[in-house]
């Protein structure tokens, strides 16, 4: 709490400007009227106040708006946003994408803080879904944003928003998240032709089922090893040697370097050694010739 002291003669602020830059904590408290501050919030950003001074200004706004700031003030908070707590932000009703952008700009270059996470959560919940413009904005500021959402939250992303997603936005997504995003991407890109479709869908393939991988193998896509290594193991296992060869094209030679890593290792264990030998890569560990493979999981399903 700042002590209530009278404003020194001649120091009363008539407007929010650079003359306040070196005011002491108590001088700001005594000499700046909260209503004036609220109406001239857009000027605060241009003045290089210290964190301590921003604390005083925040305290003034809190007294003026105990139930939460109006959006007209929020939009112009600028660096004052750095002083807001998640509790403060939960009182807000932010509906404008421009307001969201303005506040994210202040935090640009920094990791996502609890304040930013709360702001985004409030904004998205207010909109009801993660629309394309919002997703565009959020991933521009935080490339990893999409992968920070739970599968349940991702389910509210409309397929049309998937067009805003860049490959790097999915770098930290786990298989559960890609399971949700892949069908949306498939739907979003369904009208594209073969090669263009593959370029767009490639980043999402960690959520693709076996049938889709089989279909891609018929399209000469030449999937790179990095993408192949991110595929779901359970989706890769049923693929035949011929299908994997077609899927990878010239990149098939890379299997040798990855033979001890999943999903390649597990896939090798499911293939006949004869079939693996046809690749000429020296892959070892397949099912020896003459052995019968029983798929017990299929038997259980039938019974």
């Amino acid at each position: 709490e700042v002590e209530k002291t009278a404003c020194p003669s001649g120091k009363k602020a008539r407007e929010i400007d650079e003359s306040l830059i070196f005011y002491k904590k108590w001088e700001l408290e005594a000499c700046v009227d909260a209503a004036l501050l609220a109406t001239q919030m857009d000027r605060v950003n241009a003045i290089p106040f210290t964190y301590e001074q921003l604390d005083v200004l925040k305290h003034k706004l809190d007294e003026l708006y105990p139930q939460g700031y109006p959006e007209s003030v929020i939009q112009h908070l600028g660096y004052l946003f750095l002083k807001m707590s998640p509790e403060d932000i939960r009182k807000w009703n932010v509906t404008s994408l421009e307001t969201l952008k303005a506040l994210l700009e202040v935090n640009k270059g920094h990791e996502m803080s609890p304040q930013v996470a709360t702001l985004i959560d409030r904004f998205v919940k207010g909109r009801g879904q993660l629309d394309k413009d919002t997703l565009d904005t959020l991933t521009a500021f935080y490339p990893g944003y999409l992968c920070s959402l739970s599968p349940e939250e991702l389910s509210s992303v409309p397929p049309s928003s998937i067009w805003a997603v860049r490959p790097q936005d999915l770098d930290t997504c786990d298989p559960r998240q890609l399971d949700v995003l892949y069908p949306k991407a498939r739907l979003a890109f369904q009208n594209m032709n073969g090669s263009e479709y593959f370029v767009k869908i490639q980043s999402f393939l960690g959520g693709a089922p076996t049938e889709d991988l089989k279909a891609l193998s018929q399209q000469n896509v030449s999937m790179d090893l990095a993408t192949f290594m991110k595929l779901r193991t359970d989706a890769v296992l049923p693929l035949t040697v011929a299908e994997v060869q077609k899927l990878l094209g010239p990149h098939v030679e890379g299997l040798k370097a990855e033979e001890r890593h999943r999903p390649v290792r597990d896939w090798i264990l499911r293939q006949r050694q004869d079939d693996l030998d046809t690749l000429g890569l020296g892959l070892q560990g397949g099912i020896p010739n003459g052995y019968l493979v029983l798929d017990l999981s299929m038997q259980e399903a039938l019974s």
Epitope: I21, P48, T50, Y51, E52, Q53, G78, V106
Partner: antibody
Framework: EVQLLESGGGLVQPGGSLRLSCAAS????????MSWVRQAPGKGLEWVSA????????YYADSVKGRFTISRDNSKNTLYLQMNSLRAEDTAVYYC???????????????WGRGTLVTVSS | IQLTQSPSSLSASVGDRVTITCRAS??????LAWYQQKPGKAPKLLIY???SLESGVPSRFSGSGSGTDFTLTISSLQPEDFATYYC?????????FGGGTKVEIK
């Protein structure tokens, strides 16, 4: 090239005066608050004074208040420090320094001059 | 706000991991910067906002901390890193610097 160049240092007797200058180039000088920071021989850094971009607001450390005056001429891209009633303890290298950003609470310095030595001695 | 740096000096070898601490007399959130100064030269900004690396500064330098306790770490000391390091708070006026830590060759 972005740089700051101080001048005006030298030997002065106690009670005397000196005016330091700092010529700025390579950035929009008038957009940035500027500071003077000093360093006594073999000692640490001490923030002495600061001035807003327009020159309308100033700040002084208690140790120099009433004796030093900071000013700027934006048309000449130059920062000044007028030092009066100098004392032996004012002996130091004086650096002019540019604030990191034009706005925001970022009061640290990303550009420094090479410094000018002020020696107060009889 | 007073900043206390420790140690005031240390001896280390090339390749060593070096840690310097800075303690503030009151909480300053993450409003702390670190500088490197070599003899006869001006200070050079290394870290701001306690942990953000200034552009062009090698990634072997890192900063951490919040509130009152802060750390500057050099993960693998290089010959050019032998210098004096200062912390500076910018939470409020007057801006203040720590007393410095001199890193010398062992």
């Amino acid at each position: 090239e972005v740089q700051l160049l101080e001048s005006g240092g030298g030997l002065v007797q106690p009670g005397g005066s000196l005016r330091l200058s700092c010529a700025a180039s390579g950035f929009t000088f008038s957009s940035y608050a500027m500071s003077w920071v000093r360093q006594a021989p073999g000692k640490g850094l001490e923030w002495v004074s600061a001035i807003s971009g327009s020159g309308g607001s100033t700040y002084y450390a208690d140790s120099v208040k009433g004796r030093f005056t900071i000013s700027r001429d934006n048309s000449k891209n130059t920062l000044y420090l007028q030092m009066n009633s100098l004392r032996a303890e004012d002996t130091a290298v004086y650096y002019c320094a540019k604030r990191w950003g034009k706005d925001g609470p970022y009061w640290y310095f990303d550009l420094w001059g090479r410094g000018t030595l002020v020696t107060v001695s009889s | 706000i007073q900043l206390t740096q420790s140690p005031s000096s240390l001896s280390a070898s090339v390749g060593d991991r070096v840690t310097i601490t800075c303690r503030a007399s009151q909480g300053i959130s993450s409003a702390l910067a670190w500088y490197q100064q070599k003899p006869g030269k001006a200070p050079k900004l290394l870290i701001y906002d306690a942990s953000s690396l200034e552009s062009g500064v090698p990634s072997r330098f890192s900063g951490s901390g919040s509130g009152t306790d802060f750390t500057l770490t050099i993960s693998s000391l290089q010959p050019e890193d032998f210098a004096t390091y200062y912390c500076q708070q910018f939470n409020n006026y007057p801006l203040t610097f720590g007393g410095g830590t001199k890193v010398e060759i062992k």
